[in-house]
């Protein structure tokens, strides 16, 4: 029986050109994490394997950095990075847990003229 839960960084709205960290955390289970995959839509961005370490997909190598921890850092954001990202935890003996994070990357013109958050 799968008892674990995935906690994520939560959805993120960022400006073009910036960088963000995507993170997930698996809790409430004693299952062993064997591998974590990071995907966007149907594209594999990166893999962190418990034995083999990190592998970043060649097409993302220049803009994606491993970590912190099992997370992923996305740099030099473009509006095309807008989309849903999945952290897929492969565990034994539980099986697979998936977390979802939506990243919205805004053109600076949209960020300036749209609904703005007041800075405390």
């Amino acid at each position: 029986m799968m008892t674990g839960t995935i906690e994520t960084t939560g959805n993120i709205s960022a400006e073009k050109g910036g960088s963000i960290i995507l993170q997930c955390h698996l809790s409430s289970t004693t299952a062993q994490v064997t591998q974590v995959n990071w995907e966007q839509q149907d594209q594999l961005l990166a893999i962190c394997n418990a034995d083999l370490g990190w592998h970043i997909s060649p097409s993302f190598k220049d803009r994606v950095a491993p970590g912190p921890g099992l997370g992923l850092t996305l740099q030099s954001l473009t509006v095309n990075d807008t989309g849903e990202y999945f952290c897929i935890y492969h565990t034994y003996p539980d099986g697979t847990y998936t977390g979802r994070i939506f990243l919205e990357v805004l053109e600076s013109s949209v960020a300036e003229h749209g609904a703005r958050f007041q800075i405390p």
Epitope: T9, S13, V79, V110, A115
Partner: antibody, heavy 117, light 112 residues
């Protein structure tokens, strides 16, 4: 002025499929995410999913996966939602809504769908 | 999914009253950068829902200053300082921090 103009009311038979359109005007269509929301029984609001007009990416509420398919036509600034294998449970008002920073700032006028034999 | 609970379900008022609507979530709505995507909407009969407040406390353009939002973490409040006839309708909160976004069940603001 931002406007989202939806297609008109529909009466369809169970088992059929139908497509609702949402034509955007007054802003840069590719600069904002488009969401779809279901309102049942004149009360409950449920998020169906979203589409990113710029790259065609989608995100769905698991509850509506296989029920709704979201697409866009950038040339006409129009978003579409196709609803499949309709049943009486799908009878509702459906809204398209633009979002920015995960709040829905502009909404279409709603499309009433009635599924009945 | 994050469960969003709104209270009360119904709120009978007299014009000129000050009222509060509560919205509670099953987990914190602050993301890892400390931003909270919690918004409030008014849905009047025969109209589309309209955005009132975004990011907990920011009034959307054209929204009167009698509307205010507050809260943090899992507990949020919408206040109307002086209820006017045009404020009657269904109020909804929406959390956009976690996938999928989820709405509260709604609060009906109606005349006593």
């Amino acid at each position: 002025e931002v406007q989202l103009q939806q297609s008109g009311p529909e009466l369809v038979k169970p088992g059929a499929s139908m497509k609702i359109s949402c034509k955007a005007s007054g802003y840069s269509f590719t600069g904002y995410i488009m969401n779809w929301v279901k309102q049942s029984h004149g009360k409950n609001l449920e998020w169906i999913g979203l589409i990113v007009p710029n790259n065609g990416g989608t995100s769905y509420n698991q509850k509506f996966k296989g029920k709704a398919t979201l697409t866009v036509d950038k040339s006409s600034n129009t978003a579409y939602m196709e609803l499949l294998s309709l049943t009486s449970e799908d009878s509702a008002v459906y809204y398209c809504a633009r979002s920015l920073r995960f709040s829905f700032d502009y909404w279409g006028q709603g499309t009433t769908l009635t599924v009945s034999s | 999914d994050v469960v969003v609970t709104q209270t009360p379900l119904s709120l009978p008022v007299s014009f000129g009253d000050q009222v509060s609507i509560s919205c509670r979530s099953s987990q914190s709505l602050a993301n890892s950068y400390g931003t909270t995507y919690l918004s409030w909407y008014l849905h009047k009969p025969g109209q589309s829902p309209q955005l009132l407040i975004y990011g907990i406390s920011n009034r959307f353009s054209g929204v009167p200053d009698r509307f205010s939002g507050s809260g943090s973490g899992t507990d949020f409040t919408l206040k109307i300082s002086t209820v006017k006839p045009e404020d009657l309708g269904m109020y909804y909160c929406l959390q956009g921090t976690h996938q999928p976004p989820t709405f509260g069940g709604g609060t009906k603001l109606e005349i006593k």
